[in-house]
């Protein structure tokens, strides 16, 4: 009679995380008696996965009923596979011994590879806002995937970016991997509505890559442009001066009027108009009583935007001259701002 052989027909098995792995094993003889055991790995540090004789292995079920007459099928199923289950599994026949069973024959082993999907990419931008023409860094992270091969791309508004660096860790063999990428993006004034997208492609995703996004509205600060103009006389000895605050983002803005350097009024931008590019416009009015001034008046519109140092624009009001429309030469576009009288 030929000596018992342990046959593991599959050199390798590939299973998606969360699924059930079937590890096949058959013996060629019913003799000798003794239990089958399954191990992950070889040598003294091997891990017991299943023992036919005793023990409780909740994730493991046998494919066949081992109590069946003439059974020689010792295949097992391992449920709810995770990347940590990857490794080489050996089906080992033991011969009955006293007091302990003796290892008799081992199968050649089956390598279990686990395909695990990457986690949804998380894109994070800089901690502080930056202004147009500045370069900012975005990071993208995804974890828990296997095998190691993965592709990461960056896009800004659908256009692929090229200035980025990517690392996959660890470098050596592991049950699962992580990817970390940093992309550099140059901001423009039109980027309030822009998006930066990190796209991850992996064999487990079947051609449907995962995407993580960051809105540049969280990153960009577009400083305002100021224009101070004098409006036509509204009443004898009264002059209307407006401060047009244009193309700013985010909305957080405080405006202060100064008359000859003295604070006249402070207000916070509330009812603003939004431009197509996502920036805001706002207009503030100041009614100046000319008769109250003997000398020329220097009116200053001072704006503190998003906690940044104040910017200002001044306008000289000649008291000696008969009130008429005066103004700075700044070209003003017709913004359709929501104008408010301020008294």
């Amino acid at each position: 009679e030929e000596e018992l052989q342990v046959i593991q027909p599959d050199k390798s098995v590939l299973v998606a995380a969360g699924e059930t792995a079937t590890l096949r094993c058959t013996a060629t003889s019913l003799i000798p008696v003794g239990p089958i055991q399954w191990f992950r790995g070889a040598g003294p540090g091997r891990e017991l996965i299943y023992n036919q004789k005793e023990g409780h292995f909740p994730r493991v079920t046998t494919v066949s009923d081992l109590t069946k007459r003439n059974n020689m099928d010792f295949s097992i199923r391992i449920g709810n596979i995770t990347p940590a289950d990857a490794g080489t599994y050996y089906c080992v026949k033991f011969r009955k011994g006293s007091p302990d069973d003796v290892e008799f024959k081992s199968g050649a082993g089956t390598e279990l590879s686990v395909r695990a999907k990457p986690s949804a990419p998380v894109v994070s931008g800089p901690a502080a806002r930056a202004t147009p023409q500045h370069t900012v860094s975005f990071t993208c992270e995804s974890h828990g995937f296997s095998p190691r091969d993965i592709t990461l791309k960056w896009f800004k508004n659908g256009n692929e970016l090229s200035d980025f660096q990517t690392n996959v860790d660890p470098v050596g063999e592991s049950v699962s991997y992580s990817i970390h990428s940093t992309a550099k993006v140059v901001l423009t004034r039109e980027d309030v509505h822009s998006q930066v997208i990190c796209e991850v492609a992996h064999v487990t995703l079947q051609g449907d890559p995962l995407r993580g996004t960051a809105n540049l509205s969280e990153t960009i600060r577009v400083p305002p442009t100021l224009e101070v103009t004098q409006q036509p006389v509204r009443a004898e000895n009264q002059v209307n001066v407006t401060c047009q605050v244009r193309k700013f983002y985010p909305q957080r803005l405080q405006l202060t009027w100064l008359e000859n350097g003295n604070v006249s009024r402070t207000e916070t931008a509330s009812t603003v108009t939004e431009n197509k590019d996502g920036t805001y416009n706002w207009m503030s009015w100041l009614l100046v009583n000319v008769s109250a001034h003997r000398d020329d008046v220097k009116l200053t519109c001072q704006v503190e935007h998003d906690g940044q140092p104040a910017v200002s624009k001044s306008h000289d009001l000649k008291v000696s001259a008969h009130p008429k429309e005066q103004g700075s030469n700044t070209a003003a576009e017709n913004t359709g701002s929501n104008e408010r009288n301020i008294y």
């Epitope: 003799i31 008696v33 239990p35 004789k53 005793e54 109590t67 007459r69 009955k96």
Partner: antibody
């Protein structure tokens, strides 16, 4: 040491009852083993009585003549096998052996107790 | 029920003899047969399982063969300690048919010639 030790035998009157025990040591009951009772009347051959799966299922099997009168059971926490014998007859007089059936029984009865004598007589 | 018939019921032999004992099952039991040796006042001892598997610690002069309904136990060279009674047993199990059978044969007494 791996062994089986029977107890509970003795003299009993016809129609009486007796419970035999078999304490296992050196191994744990599991579904890999069937635990069995075999008897041998004085000067006669071996006669199979009953077996029980020593694992979770605890399924039991009886010789046709033993069904209804004999009940096999086990307590895995105590690693002990039992045989409850009711309505005993003179022909039940025998040495009762406890045995371990290896590999679901297919591997033969590889471990035996020393036996306990049951005498049914008035 | 499955019946096991052993023959001969007794035999006389000398040390060094080749001894053959046969066992017949009333229906096919594949290779699910065991052989035991029993000496007076002692519990039986397993010699052969699955018709031909030699139990650990049993001398190699004992061998088993057969399948289906006809089985043989052979002692290639009888030794003084081999004089005893030998039993065959069906170890059929129940899972396929519900027909659990662990019946023993009637025994064969091997005596000194």
């Amino acid at each position: 040491e791996v062994q089986l030790v029977e107890s509970g035998g003795g003299l009993v009157q016809p129609g009486g009852s007796l419970r035999l025990s078999c304490a296992a040591s050196g191994f744990s009951f599991s579904s890999y083993y069937f635990m069995c009772w075999v008897r041998q009347a004085p000067g006669k051959g071996l006669e199979w009585v009953a077996c029980i799966d020593a694992g979770y299922s605890g399924g039991s099997h009886y010789a046709s003549w033993a069904k209804g009168r004999f009940t096999i059971s086990r307590d895995n926490s105590k690693n002990t096998l039992y045989l409850q014998m009711n309505s005993l007859r003179a022909e039940d007089t025998a040495v009762y052996y406890c045995a371990r059936a290896y590999e679901y029984g297919y591997g033969g009865y590889d471990l035996w107790g020393q036996g306990t004598l049951v005498t049914v007589s008035s | 029920d499955i019946q096991m018939t052993q023959s001969p019921s007794s035999l006389s032999a000398s040390v060094g003899d080749r001894v053959t004992i046969t066992c017949q099952a009333s229906q096919s039991i594949d290779s699910n047969l065991a052989w035991y040796q029993q000496k007076p006042g002692k519990a039986p001892k397993l010699l052969i399982y699955r018709a031909s598997g030699l139990e650990s610690g049993v001398p190699s002069r004992f061998s088993g063969s057969g399948s289906g309904t006809d089985f043989t136990l052979t002692i290639s060279s009888l030794q003084p300690e081999d004089f005893a009674t030998y039993y065959c047993q069906c170890t059929y199990g129940s899972n396929d048919s519900g027909n659990y059978a662990n019946a023993f044969g009637g025994g064969t007494k091997v005596e000194i010639k």
